[in-house]
């Protein structure tokens, strides 16, 4: 069951091209950028999504000259190399032969080097901390209601079993969602916490990856939960290797 048969679309990934050319005339969808077939009954891997994002035609925009003091937020965007399963390759390089190692969510975990740089294995990100600040409300949200709603959301929308939502912390106006998933815990068919976190991040930013669904309407006991900033921290099973120069 890969895609919505009736109108041949991919409910979990709008950055796909779908056609009824699968076995027996079944609807089959391929990710933009990579052309890889995707399973539309679950989340698409972050690597394929980033690749599709980089290949998508950019909307024409009126340019605004930024202030000379403006900080650049590159949003961690690059055109990644994905393996045949759609995971990030451990080593990523750009067009100018600058290379670096990434973790399983595609975040750089070493200093940049040249083509001689070796990345022996793809290191798994096993702990993700999503730090949200919500807009002011009449009162604080009830912690257990917030916990229940966020767990429900991750289960129903992002297909992540609640056992991978380790905790939901709340100190108004800050909400922290802890996702944890060790290699030994992740069974075949389980959604990866990195993919769930990426879909959530895009939803929060109003850039939903879902096909034809409205944006995320988060409510806790009917009260809208509007997020005004998001920070995501990634912890790897093996600590990153940055030189001291970068840390000072």
């Amino acid at each position: 069951h890969t895609a919505a048969q009736d109108n041949c679309t991919c409910p979990t990934n709008k950055m796909t091209v779908c056609s009824p050319d699968g076995p027996g005339g079944r609807c089959q969808c391929r990710a933009l950028g990579s052309g890889m077939a995707v399973d539309c009954s679950t989340l698409t891997s972050k690597c394929l999504l980033l690749k599709a994002r980089m290949s998508a035609p950019k909307n024409a925009r009126t340019l605004v000259r930024p202030s000379e003091h403006a900080l650049v937020d590159n949003d961690g965007l690059y055109d990644p190399d994905c393996d045949p399963e759609g995971r990030f390759k451990a080593r990523q390089c750009n067009q100018t032969s600058v290379c670096w190692c990434v973790n399983s969510v595609g975040v750089r975990r070493t200093d940049k080097g040249d083509l001689s740089l070796r990345c022996d294995e793809l290191v798994r990100t096993h702990h993700i901390l999503i730090d949200l600040r919500h807009r002011p409300t009449a009162g604080a949200f009830n912690h257990s209601d917030l916990d229940a709603e966020l767990r429900r959301l991750f289960r129903e929308r992002y297909r992540l079993h609640p056992k991978f939502v380790a905790a939901v912390h709340y100190e108004q106006p800050t909400i922290q969602i802890e996702l944890r998933q060790n290699t030994s815990q992740k069974a075949a068919g389980d959604v990866d916490i990195g993919d769930a976190a990426y879909y959530f991040e895009r939803d929060i930013k109003g850039e939903s990856l879902f096909q034809g669904r409205g944006g995320l309407d988060l409510r806790v006991r009917g009260e809208p939960l509007q997020v005004e900033r998001t920070l995501i921290y990634y912890l790897d099973e093996i600590p990153p290797k940055f030189s001291m120069k970068r840390l000072t």
């Epitope: 916990d147 229940a148 289960r155 056992k163 991978f164 380790a166 802890e178």
Partner: antibody, heavy 119, light 111 residues
Framework: QVQLVQSGAEVKKPGASVKVSCKAS????????INWVRQAPGQGLEWMGV????????SYNQKFKGRVTMTRDTSTSTVYMELSSLRSEDTAVYYC????????????WGQGTLVTVSS | EIVLTQSPATLSLSPGERATLSCRVS??????????MHWYQQKPGQAPRLLIY???NLESGIPARFSGSGSGTDFTLTISSLEPEDFAVYYC?????????FGGGTKVEIK
């Protein structure tokens, strides 16, 4: 208030199929997945599978794979469970049950549908 | 699959007495301190009713005489003082891993 209302009792012959419905009301239908649980006479509870009302696909207990099909109709907020190749051991009360908010507990249950398989 | 073993199979008690029901699990259902263990009550001819979720959380509308405890592989449902309407069958259930499984049940009957 949340309610799950199931279709009426059925009597079927061995080898036939049965389709049981479960109509949900009192909440946003696509917000919660629906499970199916059965209970043979005088026996315990057995989980059959769960359907995502949001996506429409289902995950089945391996024991029933190939014989059970769960579907949903969002326009009527109804979930269906079809069991094929019926045998006498399938005589049971079939329940639909909604996932609760946070921990995959079953917080609301239908009243049950008795399916009797007899020649 | 995860196997749940409930004991005793039958518990004969009088109203006002304390009931202690046990559920042992073949492997841990704990994930980062969250135990995916739930308790249900079922009366003859009725659907099960959720009493306790996540091992120790009382479901809304359930009397405070019901409580749950335990973690990992050993869980307990306690009814502090039995009321006449509490005589029923009680099931534990795990939702840690597919297929979700139930214990065989403990029947609490009037002595």
């Amino acid at each position: 208030q949340v309610q799950l209302v199931q279709s009426g009792a059925e009597v079927k012959k061995p080898g036939a199929s049965v389709k049981v419905s479960c109509k949900a009301s009192g909440y946003t239908f696509t917000d919660y997945s629906i499970n199916w649980v059965r209970q043979a006479p005088g026996q315990g509870l057995e989980w059959m599978g769960v359907i995502s009302t949001y996506y429409g696909d289902a995950s089945y207990n391996q024991k029933f794979k190939g014989r059970v099909t769960m579907t949903r109709d969002t326009s009527t907020s109804t979930v269906y469970m079809e069991l094929s190749s019926l045998r006498s051991e399938d005589t049971a009360v079939y329940y639909c049950a909604r996932y609760g908010d946070g921990y995959n507990q079953f917080d609301y249950w239908g009243q049950g549908t008795l399916v009797t398989v007899s020649s | 699959e995860i196997v749940l073993t409930q004991s005793p199979a039958t518990l004969s008690l009088s109203p006002g007495e304390r009931a202690t029901l046990s559920c042992r699990v073949s492997e841990s259902v704990d994930s980062y301190g969250n135990n995916f263990m739930h308790w249900y009550q079922q009366k003859p001819g009725q659907a099960p009713r959720l009493l306790i979720y996540r091992a120790s959380n009382l479901e809304s509308g359930i009397p405070a005489r019901f409580s749950g405890s335990g973690s990992g592989t050993d869980f307990t449902l306690t009814i502090s003082s039995l009321e006449p309407e509490d005589f029923a069958v009680y099931y534990c259930q795990q939702s840690y891993e597919d297929p979700y499984t139930f214990g065989g049940g403990t029947k609490v009957e009037i002595k």
